[in-house]
């Protein structure tokens, strides 16, 4: 056993030069996905197909405004230095798309939008800015809709199940649907101060006529319409002694 | 054993030259891609699918937003040192769909919208912008409409289940759909300092009709309207001392 | 030292920054939204000595050192983030910085 | 230590910055939203000794050394961070700052 | 009624700086992105920049540097101001809701104003 | 920078005919779908007729249709009627703040 190891280490030695320079753009990029995916604190890539992503993605100003920044990279302010606590990534804004909540789903045994469930990461202090984004389907005449952000708290003595967060009043006229946008930055930072309190939401954009003019739940050729969150957090990562 | 390690430490070393050129591209990628989800703290890639990405991702100004930002990549504050307690990614914004809640679903026996989890790592006071982004669906005819976020609220003695979060009155056109974001800060960090209190959100959004225009559970078509919470944090990750 | 730009057509030798981009959706990563593919770069080319990796940015094979010494490596000396958009697999886009993914410049170290 | 740029045509032996862009799409992480492919670069070239690597940007075999004792290695000085939108798993889209997966600045340490 | 309308100088001389402005109607700006796009007489349609609902810019390769576009969100109004004005600037300059390319933006545009280069 | 090839540039049928308009980008749009059909007349702005590569427009007439992904598109009017006689435009979006309008293609009426 010890004249083969010796013989195995005899021919690794005479073709280490050439397996130096065999080394492939392949790897590296191999190497790349597994960082990035060490940085996001992800243990694997996130299965998801393209066809859910064209559903799911918001056809949204945010989603655009976002790609269209792309083509600044650098950090021309960044002295670089390769310490270790700057290795993760650093999340500035979180879209956050409704999920199922029981409790919504027993008000009245239909589902309601929505519930947005929050990671215990976000510390409510951190939170710049706060928006429920929430498309309106387009009118054929021109109305007045009258946007409604609902809070589902416990039921009160009264039979009283939701408080107000906001409501607008806003002009549409016939065309493409329009996305609207309503701050809720108080109402997410009692929800990460007080989880509990988080119940879920309901949404209401009536026309004149009372049609509920909000895409709450997709429908078909909808894809992208659902409402969102965007969420921007500030992150100020400290520094370690030496 | 000592013989046989000496001897493949000296034709390892012959080899050296070539092997350092044999890495490929394909495992530099892999290697990103490993710490990638490890600075996400993913211990695997999220298993999502294109589908389900195209259902859950907002059609909204915030996801375009973020996306359109992606040509100034670079952090002008960062200093780029990498610090061991700076590995992991830091959060800036998340995005939060409703989930199912089983207080919600019990109020009277069909699912309501919405309820929101929220991780315990967000901490109430990073909070700095909330908002809970609904999607109202197009008005025929110009209309007024009244949006009301209701946060659920154990029941009181009276029989109250809800305590208003935000109101707001708008006008809508006929046309499409419209995105509105409600501030909902104050409830999020109230929520994430008494997690027990978020029992979950009605949004309403009636027209002058009575019609609810908000999209709380996307129909068919609606994929990307559903309510979503964007919650900006701000992240100060400690450092470690050396 | 301001470090060298190469190309794959280089003969240089030396520790050299060389081009790579990553494609994303070239390896079906759709679920990352933004950027589609961004420009990593790599360093790449002859130090005194090699060390271990610490980042899969300088991807060593890794070996005994025969001479038991430590030697400098050809790794990056700046480096600079890119901005993602992204699927986190939890019913959320996430928008966030990803630091020390482009490599600006490469150096023996 | 400013390093060297190289590309894939460059000769440069030293360790040098490479350009490698990591795409997302190309490898079906379709929970990354944002970016869907960014540049990583990464590292390579020679130092005296090959040490474990830490980032892919410098992509060094492993190997032992047969002297012995440990060397520099061709790895990043200088990096930032890359900002991605990504879902969590968790019904959220996370939108953060992932440090170091840039390299910009490779060097042997 | 939800309209936009382009206003500014009809005849601009050469290297002079063009002002115009989109005054808006029925559109919440701070909600809403805005295209520029110009057509010279005869010819085909060519994008300008933009101005995003979050007052990002976003403009076309040839007119950076030339170009600033700005917003006034309680006046209703976007400005487009281009300097060093050459006769081949001369065109129909258009305001649109939304981004031409991006969902349905561009489903909302303004007449347009012809603007002359000219010494 | 990016090129958006229309052809053909003049497309001359009668009324009921079928007409195929063609699209090609130098690069592939953003998404493989951010690419929106424009219909202008003269003196007139252009009007929004497809979006999103293949969803039709408010207000449009079905036999107006999209189709395509990446580079390659296709817009076809399954019917041709008198007032479709204008000049089409495709408009590309790339990410990175880029957009591109094709240099257009002119329906004619016989």
């Known amino acids: 056993e010890n004249s083969e190891q010796k013989e195995n280490v005899e021919k690794e030695g005479l073709c280490n030069a050439c397996t130096w320079r065999q080394n492939t753009k392949s790897s590296r990029i191999e190497a790349i996905k597994i960082q990035i995916l060490s940085k996001l604190r992800l243990e694997t890539a996130p299965n998801i197909s393209k066809d859910a992503i064209r559903q799911l993605l918001p056809k949204a100003p945010p989603l655009r405004e976002l790609i269209d920044q792309y083509d600044v990279q650098r950090d021309d302010s960044s002295d670089g230095s390769l310490e270790d606590d700057d290795y993760h990534a650093t999340t500035e804004t979180i879209i956050t798309m409704p999920t199922e909540s029981d409790f919504l789903m027993q008000v009245d045994g239909k589902p309601k939008c929505c519930f947005f469930k929050f990671s215990s990461k976000i510390q409510y202090n951190k939170v710049v800015k706060a928006q429920l984004w929430i498309y309106l389907r387009p009118v054929e005449t021109p109305t007045t809709v009258f946007v409604q952000i609902l809070r589902l708290i416990k039921p009160m003595k009264d039979g009283t199940r939701y408080t107000g967060i906001r409501s607008l009043k806003l002009d549409m006229n016939p065309g493409t649907g329009i996305w609207q946008s309503i701050d809720v930055k108080t109402v997410l930072q009692n929800w990460l101060k007080q989880p509990e309190s988080n119940l879920g939401i309901e949404i209401k954009a009536l026309d004149e006529n009372g049609h509920d003019l909000a895409v709450t739940f997709p429908g078909p050729g909808e894809d992208g319409l659902n409402p969102f969150l965007e969420v921007k957090v500030t992150d100020t990562p400290k520094r370690s002694r030496r | 054993e000592n013989s046989e390690q000496k001897e493949n430490v000296e034709k390892e070393g012959l080899c050296n030259a070539c092997t350092w050129r044999q890495n490929t591209k394909s495992s530099r990628i892999e290697a990103i891609k490993i710490q990638i989800l490890s600075k996400l703290r993913l211990e695997t890639a999220p298993n999502i699918s294109k589908d389900a990405i195209r259902q859950l991702l907002p059609k909204a100004p915030p996801l375009r937003e973020l996306i359109d930002q992606y040509d100034v990549q670079r952090d002008d504050s960062s200093d780029g040192s990498l610090e061991d307690d700076d590995y992991h990614a830091t959060t800036e914004t998340i995005i939060t769909m409703p989930t199912e809640s089983d207080f919600l679903m019990q109020v009277d026996g069909k699912p309501k919208c919405c309820f929101f989890k929220f991780s315990s790592k967000i901490q109430y006071n990073k909070v700095v912008k909330a908002q809970l982004w609904i999607y109202l669906r197009p008005v025929e005819t110009p209309t007024t409409v009244f949006v009301q976020i209701l946060r659920l609220i154990k029941p009181m003695k009276d029989g109250t289940r809800y305590t208003g979060i935000r109101s707001l009155k708008l006008d809508m056109n006929p046309g499409t759909g419209i995105w509105q974001s409600i501030d909902v800060k104050t409830v999020l960090q109230n929520w994430l300092k008494q997690p027990e209190s978020n029992l979950g959100i009605e949004i309403k959004a009636l027209d002058e009709n009575g019609h609810d225009l908000a999209v709380t559970f996307p129909g068919p078509g609606e994929d990307g309207l559903n309510p979503f919470l964007e919650v900006k944090v701000t992240d100060t990750p400690k450092r470690s001392r050396r | 030292d301001f470090g060298l730009d190469c190309d794959e057509h280089s003969t240089e030798s030396r520790c050299c920054r060389y081009p790579l981009t990553v494609d994303f959706e070239a390896f079906g990563w759709d679920w990352i939204i933004a950027p589609k593919r961004y420009k990593a770069n790599y360093c790449s080319g002859e130090c005194e000595f090699v060390f271990l990796q610490k980042y899969p940015h300088t991807h060593l094979v890794h070996q005994a050192n025969p001479r038991g010494s430590a030697g400098p490596c050809c790794t990056p000396t700046k480096m600079s983030p890119i901005n993602m958009l992204y699927f986190n697999g939890k019913e959320q886009i996430i928008y966030g910085k990803i630091p020390a993914m482009v490599v600006d410049r490469c150096g023996c170290s | 230590d400013f390093g060297l740029d190289c590309d894939e045509h460059s000769t440069e032996s030293r360790c040098c910055r490479y350009p490698l862009t990591v795409d997302f799409e190309a490898f079906g992480w379709d929970w990354i939203i944002a970016p869907k492919r960014y540049k990583a670069n990464y590292c390579s070239g020679e130092c005296e000794f090959v040490f474990l690597q830490k980032y892919p940007h410098t992509h060094l075999v492993h190997q032992a050394n047969p002297r012995g004792s440990a060397g520099p290695c061709c790895t990043p000085t200088k990096m930032s961070p890359i900002n991605m939108l990504y879902f969590n798993g968790k019904e959220q889209i996370i939108y953060g700052k992932i440090p170091a997966m840039v390299v910009d600045r490779c060097g042997c340490s | 009624q939800v309209t936009l309308k382009e206003s500014g100088p009809v005849l601009v001389k050469p290297t002079e700086t063009l002002t115009l402005t989109c005054t808006v109607s029925g559109i919440d700006l701070s909600h809403t992105d805005i295209s520029w796009v110009r057509q010279a007489p005869g010819k085909g349609l060519e994008w300008v920049g933009i101005?995003?609902?979050?007052?990002?810019?976003y403009k076309a390769s040839w007119a950076k540097g030339r170009l600033t576009i700005s917003k006034d969100t309680s006046k209703n109004q976007v400005v487009l101001t281009m300097t060093n004005m050459d006769p081949v600037d001369t065109a129909t300059y258009y305001c649109a809701r939304g981004v031409p390319a991006y969902s349905h933006g561009g489903d909302l545009w303004g007449q347009g104003t012809l603007v002359t280069v000219s010494s | 920078d990016i090129v958006m090839t229309q052809s053909p540039a003049t497309l001359s049928l009668s009324p009921g005919e079928r007409a195929t308009l063609s699209c090609t980008s130098s690069q592939s749009v953003y998404h493989a779908n951010w690419l929106s059909w424009f219909q202008q007349k003269p003196g007139q702005p252009p009007k929004l007729l497809i979006y999103?590569?293949?969803t039709l427009a408010y207000g449009v007439p079905s036999r107006f249709s999209g189709s395509g992904s990446g580079t390659d598109f296709t817009l076809t009017i399954s019917s041709l009627q008198p007032e479709d006689a204008a000049t089409y435009y495709c408009?590309?979006?790339?990410?990175?703040?880029?957009?591109?309008f094709g240099q257009g293609t002119k329906v004619e009426i016989k």
């Open positions: 408009a590309g979006g790339y990410g990175g703040g880029r957009y591109a």
């Open positions: 101005i995003s609902y979050a007052g990002s810019k």
């Open positions: 999103w590569a293949s």
